[in-house]
Interface confidence: low
């Protein structure tokens, strides 16, 4: 008769964790003639057919069920046993849920911490930016995003086996030019005949693509670069100036900055 009451027995203490070495034995109650060999499903290089022992080195997270057979002239198969391998969360990633397109300053933004699987499934989430913990939910929400929120974000998913981090995800915030100011070189008081350079400084993403300069009468000047060079500077150039910066998001303007051009000693002497 074939071997009777064949069972596959896991020798390891439970739970089994990914990476463990797992030993299984193929047991039976009686056999006539004697058992001469064993078979395993799935097959593997770790079998020792004559001993009825299966050793799985570095068990994978997806190892599910194993079954053995004890054979004399016939083979009797045991019911499969589930290894029930436990493992840290897998395939963790940051996913932008909203908005669907690029992120503009003031948008409501939601980031989701996704993972493909975890065993056990009870997990905790952690969000961090530049090493600073931001939250412990599966989502990270910004009611009104600001340029200061831009940066590199990561999420972590923990279970009792371990923790897995996502790749860093870069959050880019687009915003209209802001913090505009007109700086003057060599200073805001220049002697006539010298040169004066006015620079429109700003903070914008994407960078400013177009500048417009205005004088104290709000007249636009025929200059569209970041720097406005007056050379030679004349007393008539004295007055307040401001600039406007434009990018694909919008426009921003600077406050007024006053340039004072004073007469040279020669001019004063002639008078």
């Amino acid at each position: 008769y074939p071997p009777k009451k064949v069972t596959t027995v896991i020798q390891n203490p439970m739970p089994i964790r990914e990476g463990d070495t797992v030993t299984l034995s193929c047991n039976y109650n009686s056999s006539n003639p004697s058992v001469t060999r064993y078979e395993w499903k799935p097959h593997g290089a770790w079998e020792e057919p004559s001993l009825g022992v299966l050793k799985i080195q570095n068990v994978g997270w997806d190892n599910t069920t194993i079954a053995c057979a004890a054979c004399n002239s016939w083979c009797s198969w045991a019911s499969p046993v589930a290894l029930n391998v436990q493992y840290a969360p897998r395939d963790v990633r940051v996913r932008k849920i909203k908005p669907l397109s690029e992120i503009h300053s003031g948008n409501s933004v939601s980031l989701q911490c996704d993972f493909s699987s975890s065993h056990p499934k009870e997990v905790q989430f952690f969000w961090e930016k530049n090493g600073r913990l931001l939250g412990k939910e599966s989502q990270l929400n910004f009611d009104s995003i600001s340029p200061e929120d831009a940066g590199s974000y990561s999420c972590w998913v923990n279970n009792s086996i371990g923790q897995t981090a996502s790749k860093a995800w870069t959050l880019e915030v687009l915003y209209a030019p802001r913090r505009l100011r007109v700086s003057m070189s060599p200073g805001d008081q220049v002697m006539e005949g010298k040169s004066a350079t006015l620079t429109c400084e700003s903070d914008a993403n994407p960078p400013v693509s177009h500048y417009t300069w205005f004088d104290w009468n709000n007249q636009s000047l025929p200059y569209h670069s970041q720097k406005l060079r007056l050379e030679p500077v004349k007393v008539q150039h004295s007055g307040a100036y401001w600039c406007q910066g434009t990018n694909s998001v919008g426009k921003g303007r600077s406050p007024l900055s006053t340039l004072t051009v004073y007469y040279s000693p020669e001019t004063i002497g002639r008078r």
């Epitope: 996913r95 849920i97 909203k98 669907l100 939601s110 989701q112 499934k121 599966s138």
Partner: antibody, heavy 117, light 108 residues
């Protein structure tokens, strides 16, 4: 056997409501996101709505936003689509599918919703 | 919204030949692209996910490739059971998954 069993379709008047259930079996339901996909007669597939594993995140196609609500009851292994303010253009075969945030590997057999006066 | 455009609308192929189906996205996205097969009166069946990974039980004659905005499904040595409608789908832009309009593969 891994399967999604659907019920609850039927004929409804424009402006009416209908709730579609989808019962999951053979897999750990709360391991997976779920979605609804519809197919109008003779037309292609249109993703309608999705929900993540614990219901904390949902999404809708523009065509149904504000009218349809997706939900799930993990204790009952069930997914639902509440459809309000139905229109003639909502007439379609509605499939539930496993995969709210991934490819859809398991599909329900579909349930027909006809919106007609 | 990412728009998926499939071509051709209909492809006439003889059994044993190779069918090449194209799917173009309106904007680049990560590798979250799937292909489905649908036969008349049946729900769709997942063939390929992650651009090129075959789903369980899918024969090796089905292969996926591509990146960025251009993706391809190739069916080599076409069998009679492969005549069906095929859809591509992007599932990277949660929660705005979109399908292509479909390509019908018919017998020549």
């Amino acid at each position: 056997e891994v399967q999604l069993v659907q019920s609850g379709g039927g004929v409804v008047r424009p402006g009416g409501s209908l709730r579609l259930p989808c019962a999951a079996s053979g897999f750990t339901f709360d391991d997976y996101g779920m979605s609804w996909v519809r197919q109008a007669p003779g037309k292609g597939l249109e993703w309608v709505s999705g929900i993540n594993w614990n219901g904390g995140s949902t999404g809708y196609a523009d065509s149904v936003k504000g009218r349809f609500t997706i939900s799930r009851d993990n204790a009952k292994n069930s997914l639902y689509l509440q459809m309000n303010s139905l229109r003639a253009e909502d007439t379609a075969l509605y499939h539930c599918a496993r995969g709210g945030d991934d490819a859809f590997d398991i599909w329900g057999q579909g349930t027909m919703v006809t919106v007609s006066s | 919204r990412i728009v998926m455009t499939q071509s051709p609308g209909t492809l006439s192929v003889s059994p044993g030949e190779t069918a090449t189906l194209s799917c173009r996205a309106s904007q680049s996205f990560s590798n979250m692209l799937a292909w489905y097969q649908q036969k008349s009166g049946q729900p769709p069946r997942l063939l390929i996910y992650g651009v090129s990974t075959r789903a369980a039980g899918v024969p090796a004659r089905f292969s996926g490739s591509g990146s960025g905005t251009e993706f391809t499904l190739t069916i080599s040595n076409l069998q009679s059971e492969d005549f069906a409608v095929y859809y591509c789908q992007q599932y990277g832009d949660w929660p705005r998954y979109t399908f292509g309009q479909g390509t019908k593969v018919e017998r020549k």
